[in-house]
Interface confidence: low
């Protein structure tokens, strides 16, 4: 579908430009596979412009298509550690509202200690994204090794 | 923070749209872990629109939040080669000005021969990005295997 | 090069915003290494806004610089399977028109079961992108494990 008449002028606000880049705060308690994120200039190079954090999970404030990206590095890890503790899997998904729950992106570590990926996906205001790390290995909290972000791309 | 009044019209220039995609030129001399990049239509599909190269390193010309991405493939590599020469690590960071020096993104190869990742990060005019490859293995110069780029996302 | 006088107003249409995110439909017949893609709201979270599918391959409708991204996960795979069936390689390239045929992005699986990467590249109206998976292993059709997309970034 085309977006409007060719000459419609674009208000800056309507560009959306919602964007967030988060760093790992902590892992969940036993039986909770979720990673808990934090963001803000005081923490370093993480930030939230539009989206918000709700108990460490990222909540979307603007409908649109987003580029979602993530990198997670396992701490105290070698290729043998990774294969020994296989399967260690990371999944990014919409976890609330429950009616929209779905896995968006999933990767296993196999013999590697880092996974990194990205994808385009439609998200709606109120969608909360959860990142589930299953397995016995812990993620690194180094800000250049583990991060999670979204970027609004278009309506 | 919201960007302006909802109806403010957006000049094309202010979109920024600074973008660059680079291909590997060469590695540094002994004791210099940096990769040296090149870009321009004459070289193939690499380009610089806004950012510039300074002695093979990428210098930013416009403040903003950028998506930084990289893929590096090791040459003459198998999973046993990669594990044998472990640790081989790639780090992307701001290397100048020194006051802003920081590692932005870091990955190890472990038993793989390619790393690829991306992240959002604030960059300022004058920031120079360096990509450090530590270890004894050499990167492939094939333009579809090793590349490095940035894309301005928002102010 | 700069894009226009600083105060030129930007029509919404000229933003381009062409974007697509596809899910795997099927692999090709014997001797055809191409992956065949599908997209549309009825299929889940895949979509095409601007680009089109031509016999399962993605055709570009607007000139510009695009961010191309892909993730492919091998089905029924472990790190031992992946290394045993090595080399399994994924390549994304322009496959038509023939005069513009080129490989844009290439990765091998080595001991991993998932590859994911992204890059910026200039594409022209009419360019068709093909994704070739060479080797004996089959890709997963799970929509959170295997996907392919493009995002228009700038003219």
């Amino acid at each position: 579908q085309r977006f409007a008449q060719a000459q419609q002028q674009l208000p800056l606000e309507s560009l959306g430009w919602d964007v967030a880049e988060l760093q790992l705060n902590h892992t969940g308690p036993q039986q909770d596979p979720r990673l808990y994120w934090q963001g803000g200039p005081a923490l370093g190079r993480s930030f939230l412009h539009g989206p918000e954090l709700d108990k460490g999970q990222l909540r979307i404030h603007r409908d649109g298509i987003y580029m979602v990206h993530i990198q997670v590095t396992l701490a105290i890890c070698s290729s043998t550690t990774a294969s020994r503790h296989h399967p260690t899997t990371l999944a990014v998904g919409i976890c609330s509202p429950a009616s929209r729950s779905i896995s968006l992106l999933r990767l296993s570590f196999h013999q590697g200690c880092t996974i990194a990926s990205q994808r385009l996906t439609p998200l709606a205001r109120g969608d909360t994204l959860c990142t589930n790390l299953t397995g016995t290995l812990l993620p690194s909290r180094n800000t250049d090794e583990t991060f999670f972000g979204v970027q609004w791309v278009r309506p | 923070q919201r960007f302006a009044q909802a109806q403010q019209q957006l000049p094309l220039e202010s979109l920024g749209w600074d973008v660059a995609e680079l291909q590997l030129n060469h590695t540094g001399p002994q004791q210099d872990p940096r990769l040296y990049w090149q870009g321009g239509p004459a070289l193939g599909r690499s380009f610089l629109h806004g950012p510039e190269l300074d002695k093979g390193q990428l210098r930013i010309h416009r403040d903003g939040i950028y998506m930084v991405h990289i893929q590096v493939t090791l040459a003459i590599c198998s999973s046993t080669t990669a594990s044998r020469h472990h640790p081989t690590t790639l780090a992307v960071g701001i290397c100048s000005p020194a006051s802003r020096s920081i590692s932005l993104l870091r990955l190890s190869f472990h038993q793989g021969c390619t790393i690829a990742s991306q992240r959002l990060t604030p960059l300022a005019r004058g920031d120079t990005l360096c990509t450090n490859l530590t270890g004894t293995l050499l990167p492939s110069r094939n333009t579809d295997e090793t590349f490095f780029g940035v894309q301005w996302v928002r102010p | 090069q700069r894009f226009a006088q600083a105060q030129q107003q930007l029509p919404l249409e000229s933003l381009g915003w062409d974007v697509a995110e596809l899910q795997l439909n099927h692999t090709g017949p014997q001797q055809d290494p191409r992956l065949y893609w599908q997209g549309g709201p009825a299929l889940g979270r895949s979509f095409l806004h601007g680009p089109e599918l031509d016999k399962g391959q993605l055709r570009i409708h607007r000139d510009g610089i695009y961010m191309v991204h892909i993730q492919v996960t091998l089905a029924i795979c472990s790190s031992t399977t992946a290394s045993r069936h090595h080399p399994t390689t994924l390549a994304v390239g322009i496959c038509s028109p023939a005069s513009r045929s080129i490989s844009l992005l290439r990765l091998s699986f080595h001991q991993g079961c998932t590859i994911a990467s992204q890059r910026l590249t200039p594409l022209a109206r009419g360019d068709t992108l093909c994704t070739n998976l060479t080797g004996t292993l089959l890709p997963s059709r799970n929509t959170d494990e295997t996907f392919f997309g493009v995002q228009w970034v700038r003219p």
Epitope: - | T80, T81 | S78, S83
Partner: antibody, heavy 118, light 110 residues
Framework: QVQLQQWGAGLLKPSETLSLTCAVY????????WSWIRQPPGKGLEWIGE???????NYNPSLKSRVTISVDTSKNQFSLKLSSVTAADTAVYYC????????????WGQGTMVTVSS | QSALTQPASVSGSPGQSLTISCTGT?????????VSWYQQHPGKAPKLMIY???IRPSGVSNRFSGSKSGNTASLTISGLQAADEADYYC??????????FGGGTKVTVL
């Protein structure tokens, strides 16, 4: 064709230290883990431990306090030391290559019979 | 770490099929596909017959096959031959990063 050749003392007294060496011929040394496995007479196989070219080790918890596995990459060799031996340590000791790409011991040495007797 | 559990002996006539079970736990056989099987003739070193649960190395007869269900792996020998008479051991990688063998099964060809 990769081959493993092993040697070491075959007769020990209780409380002495067992010492065996295994040499790797005809293939990559650094791309694998290398293990020691033993088999008491008439009994089953027991994994002792493993090492890689950089010296990373994993040991059987039941033997860990007495076992040392070391590596000499310049000679493509790895060695086993088992301290404070008793008659229960009497066994055929094998060295083997651990193929991480196969999750198995794919190449074995010929075995060395070690007897502990006073 | 406890050894994997195998029957002490199984037997069969030439041409028949027989199956050896190997029972572990959710920390070894149940969690990984790193299950392998070894054949050992008297006075010889063990020989790898099956790895990754069901994969045969080159040179191993296709009469040998492997499978796994839950915490139990199985080795099946079809078209039993006199040369198959030997001891058979299963092996698994464990969650703690170690390897564990089964107690062994003596196969007798009647």
């Amino acid at each position: 064709q990769v081959q493993l050749q092993q040697w070491g003392a075959g007769l020990l007294k209780p409380s002495e230290t067992l010492s065996l060496t295994c040499a790797v011929y005809g293939g990559s040394f650094s791309g694998y883990y290398w293990s020691w496995i033993r088999q008491p007479p008439g009994k089953g196989l027991e994994w002792i431990g493993e090492i890689n070219h950089s010296g990373s080790t994993n040991y059987n918890p039941s033997l860990k306090s007495r076992v040392t596995i070391s590596v000499d990459t310049s000679k493509n060799q790895f060695s086993l030391k088992l301290s404070s031996v008793t008659a229960a340590d009497t066994a055929v000791y094998y060295c083997a290559r651990v193929s991480r790409s196969r999750g198995a011991f794919d190449i074995w040495g010929q075995g060395t019979m070690v007897t502990v007797s006073s | 770490q406890s050894a994997l559990t195998q029957p002490a002996s199984v037997s069969g006539s030439p041409g028949q099929s027989l199956t050896i079970s190997c029972t572990g736990t959710s920390s070894d056989v149940g969690v990984y596909n790193y299950v392998s099987w070894y054949q050992q003739h008297p006075g010889k070193a063990p020989k790898l017959m099956i790895y990754d649960v069901g994969i045969r190395p080159s040179g191993v007869s296709n009469r040998f096959s492997g499978s796994k269900s839950g915490n139990t792996a199985s080795l099946t020998i079809s078209g039993l031959q006199a040369a198959d008479e030997a001891d058979y051991y299963c092996n698994s990688y464990t969650r703690s990063g170690t390897w564990v063998f089964g107690g062994g099964t003596k196969v007798t060809v009647l």
